[in-house]
């Protein structure tokens, strides 16, 4: 299943994009566990200062002290690591300064498996402070497997810092990734630490490794790309089915539901029923009765048709074909109208033509 749905479900789609931190190389402060850390907000004319950690408001507690333009963390722990920001609110504008805190007692290795960034005496990084490469946000790199539908575009990113500023190169399946290795080549934006491959095809599947290095060290990170030739989707139900139907009392009727699904679907026929004269429960959800569901001995063709024999007035109402798979659920509904029988004759109105 792709790690993203190409088009979000409207009900889940955020009204605004998630906050993105637009920093290439924030100040970095490093401390060992148990040490205390003090950082001064480097903003001028800061009348009112507010603090955040990883985008969440930061308030004082038994280990965090906020005094004026200073942030103090007593007895630092690895959980204190993250992206901090101080925002100075002025009458006409506001300004934000970002910095990283790394609380670690391990020297960073060539790969990023341990998610650590090197033990140093905590000092602000500046031009005199040489530093091996480090990832600016290891959490965002934790998801390594990415499935993308064919014909779409993938962007791999490995934002890093270091002093001097590291360089970046890319490998595919452990070997140098050259433009001629794929039709249309690829694009790199070093300032965004990104690799873009347009219109991916199955041959693009594989491991992509960014190698970030300067004279003080090298780190690397590997993403696995899977190219899905068809987007997995929830079941698709044929338009217009099931169709509304009507019959007389004592007659027979059938509802048809055509289901298309790449993943194995589970199909149910459901009747909307009344309980104590109400169609809806106290929670506002409708009362439902499962009439037919796929079982061990039921074929797909059998489950796609719901037969109702010897119809009574109680059978009138709304019927729903519900199909679900590992990706989601789809359903279509139709109404059954039951008419009184004229005399003794059992007359059935012409059933709808189900073929399109």
């Amino acid at each position: 299943r792709p790690s993203f749905s190409l088009v979000e479900d409207t009900t889940l789609e955020p009204e605004e994009p998630p906050t993105k931190y637009q920093i290439s190389q924030p100040e970095v402060y490093v401390a060992a566990p148990g040490e205390s850390l003090e950082v001064r907000c480097l903003l001028k004319d800061a009348a009112v200062i507010s603090w955040t950690k990883d985008g969440v408001h930061l308030g004082p507690n038994n280990r965090t002290v906020l005094i004026g333009e200073y942030l103090q963390i007593k007895g630092a722990t690895p959980r204190d690591s993250g992206l901090y920001a101080c925002t100075a609110s002025r009458t006409v504008d506001s300004e934000t300064w970002y910095f990283m805190v790394n609380v670690t007692d391990a020297i960073s290795s060539g790969d990023d498996e341990d998610d650590t960034d090197g033990a140093e005496d905590f000092v602000s990084e500046n031009s005199n402070n040489k530093r091996a490469p480090y990832w600016t946000n290891t959490e965002k790199m934790e998801k390594r497997l990415h499935a993308v539908p064919a014909a779409n575009t993938v962007k791999f990113r490995c934002p890093a810092g270091g002093n001097p500023m590291p360089t970046m190169r890319w490998l595919k399946n452990g070997k140098e990734f050259k433009q001629e290795h794929r039709i249309g080549g690829y694009k790199v934006r070093n300032q965004h630490w990104s690799l873009i491959m347009e219109s991916v095809v199955p041959s693009d599947k594989g491991n992509y490794t960014c190698v970030v290095e300067n004279e003080y060290g090298s780190i690397n990170h590997t993403y696995h790309l899977d190219v899905v030739e068809r987007s997995p989707h929830r079941p698709i139900l044929q338009a217009g089915l099931p169709a509304n139907a009507s019959t007389v009392v004592g007659g027979d009727v059938e509802f048809v539901c055509k289901v298309y699904s790449d993943a194995q679907p589970h199909i149910q026929w459901i009747k909307h029923v009344e309980k104590n004269g109400s169609k809806y429960g106290p929670d506002g959800l409708p009362y439902l009765k499962v009439l037919k569901a796929a079982g061990v001995n039921t074929t797909d063709k059998e489950i796609e048709v719901l037969y109702i024999r010897n119809v009574t007035f109680e059978d009138a109402g709304e019927y729903t074909c519900l199909a679900g798979n590992s990706i989601g659920i789809s359903f279509h509904s139709a109404w059954l109208t039951v008419l009184p029988a004229p005399g003794r004759e059992k007359e059935i109105t012409a059933s709808p033509d189900y073929l399109e």
Epitope: F4, S5, L6
Partner: antibody, heavy 127, light 107 residues
Amino acid sequence: EVQLVESGGGLVQPGGSLRLSCAASGFPFTSTGISWVRQAPGKGLEWVGRTHLGDGSTNYADSVKGRFTISADTSKNTAYLQMNSLRAEDTAVYYCARTYGIYDTYDMYTEYVMDYWGQGTLVTVSS
Amino acid sequence: DIQMTQSPSSLSASVGDRVTITCRASQDVDTSLAWYKQKPGKAPKLLIYSASFLYSGVPSRFSGSGSGTDFTLTISSLQPEDFATYYCQQSTGHPQTFGQGTKVEIK
């Protein structure tokens, strides 16, 4: 070669309905999406909505939500824009555009890009 | 909704000129910004996606830059076929929104 051809435009009275079609060819239909964008006479572009052709999911602009429905028939490689309860302000040239996703694996969001566009079809809502 | 504001609304330039159009988003859209070119009576054409990536087949005189809220489209040396209206569009927030357009006219 990727091609998108719209049809179905015309003159309709306020409150009326119209269905636009967008016939696509030259790309794997179910892997990408189709967006509808409109342009009122002498005005700028306005995004109307989008469908993903693989799973049928849809998104709409608030201005058309509840009135317009985007669908697709994958067997015919055709997307549709069903427009109901039409208003004078819906008068515009309607374009369909192939829409693909740029999957950002770091910030975990998808950027939508419309790379191929149809020629457009004019819808006029007037009494 | 995220508002996209382009400036200028129109400009006059000569063939060979360097032209810069700016686009400002009302909130952070990261690099999820595309630029389109539209000639009168024609459909728009994609020029730039992800703020700075040139779409396949687009001449290299076009370039894009920026991230967050401020973006720029630059045409390094204006050609006769570049006289058109240019639109920016953010494509991460819902709904997708376009700028009002910048018309590039012949001086």
